[in-house]
């Protein structure tokens, strides 16, 4: 039975040209995390594999940095980066847990972080 929960940074906003940290945290399970995927609906951004380390998609290599931890740092943000991001935790023996973050990249300097929330 899957008992874990994913906590994410939730709905977040950031300024164009700035950077943002996408962060998820898996709790309430003793399952072993074997891999974490960072994805958009149509493409993979990065993978952190327990044995192989980090892989950043070539499309994002210039402006995505691994970490902190299992998170992902997006740099040189553009308005085209607005949208949903998914953290997919591959675990053993539980299976797959997924968290969702919505990022809004703003033209203005008014960019505030949203509240944290949980996805069971």
């Amino acid at each position: 039975m899957m008992t874990g929960t994913i906590e994410t940074t939730g709905n977040i906003s950031a300024e164009k040209g700035g950077s943002i940290i996408l962060q998820c945290h898996l709790s309430s399970t003793t399952a072993q995390v074997t891999q974490v995927n960072w994805e958009q609906q149509d493409q993979l951004l990065a993978i952190c594999n327990a044995d192989l380390g980090w892989h950043i998609s070539p499309s994002f290599k210039d402006r995505v940095a691994p970490g902190p931890g299992l998170g992902l740092t997006l740099q040189s943000l553009t308005v085209n980066d607005t949208g949903e991001y998914f953290c997919i935790y591959h675990t053993y023996p539980d299976g797959t847990y997924t968290g969702r973050i919505f990022l809004e990249v703003l033209e203005s300097s008014v960019a505030e972080h949203g509240a944290r929330f949980q996805i069971p």
Epitope: T34, Q35, N37, E39, Q41, D42, Q43, L44, I47, N49, L52, H55, S57, S59, F86, I88, H90, T96, T98
Partner: antibody
Framework: QVQLQESGPGLVKPSQTLSLTCTVS?????????WNWIRQPPGKGLEWMGY???????KYNPSLKSRVTISRDTSKNQFSLKLSSVTAADTAVYYC???????????WGQGTLVTVSS | DIQMTQSPSSLSASVGDRVTITCKAS??????VAWYQQKPGKAPKLLIY???NRNTGVPSRFSGSGSGTDFTFTISSLQPEDFATYYC?????????FGQGTRLEIK
């Protein structure tokens, strides 16, 4: 438990538009995930055609982009495929499938054969 | 597009045999490969995702491995119900693409 069921004409004439519908039961297509069409010509491999996401965003295979349209009817919990200017090469079993957040497909319909012939 | 090349295209084996199918991607996809089983007249069934993760309910005799461009799918001890066609798929980026399939037949 989510189930997907394709429906539509089994025979389409060349140069016409192929239209198929996928009816989803056990899950609302506006709640989450991306809802895909994948086809398989007889005796051949699988080709991803495109998706419509729960929010209504679409993405298409560039090899078909000028001919394919995926839309949805949220009131009926259905999504649809239209493929224009069909030829015999479009004869295939057409599957609808639900994608996980990563690009893999855990849930499929049973498929429907569409033959393009005059 | 990322091309996925499977080998062999067909394979004859007996119940109890260990069977291995390989898939080669045209570019580095790290661990972003899935494997499906398809029986005649049926839809594909997801067995493995992200190179080595078994889908829910898939027997442990099915396994996957590999990273980068070279991937392997193994059935450790063939059962009668395993005779089918198997496909690899890259889950790295759109358009998602599949291998041409490996038909597994009874020897």
């Amino acid at each position: 438990q989510v189930q997907l069921q394709e429906s539509g004409p089994g025979l389409v004439k060349p140069s016409q538009t192929l239209s198929l519908t996928c009816t989803v039961s056990g899950y609302s297509i506006t709640d989450d995930y991306a809802w895909n069409w994948i086809r398989q010509p007889p005796g051949k491999g699988l080709e991803w055609m495109g998706y419509i996401s729960y929010s209504g965003d679409t993405k298409y295979n560039p090899s078909l982009k000028s001919r394919v349209t995926i839309s949805r009817d949220t009131s009926k919990n259905q999504f649809s495929l239209k493929l224009s200017s069909v030829t015999a090469a479009d004869t295939a079993v057409y599957y609808c499938a639900r994608k996980y957040y990563g690009g893999w497909f855990p849930v499929w319909g049973q498929g429907t054969l569409v033959t393009v012939s005059s | 597009d990322i091309q996925m090349t499977q080998s062999p295209s067909s394979l004859s084996a007996s119940v109890g045999d260990r069977v291995t199918i390989t898939c080669k991607a045209s570019q580095d996809v790290f661990t972003a490969v899935a494997w499906y089983q398809q029986k005649p007249g049926k839809a594909p069934k997801l067995l493995i995702y992200s190179a080595s993760n078994r889908n829910t309910g898939v027997p442990s005799r099915f396994s996957g491995s590999g990273s980068g461009t070279d991937f392997t799918f193994t059935i450790s001890s063939l059962q009668p119900e395993d005779f089918a066609t198997y496909y690899c798929q890259q889950q790295y980026s759109t358009p998602w693409t599949f291998g041409q399939g490996t038909r597994l037949e009874i020897k």
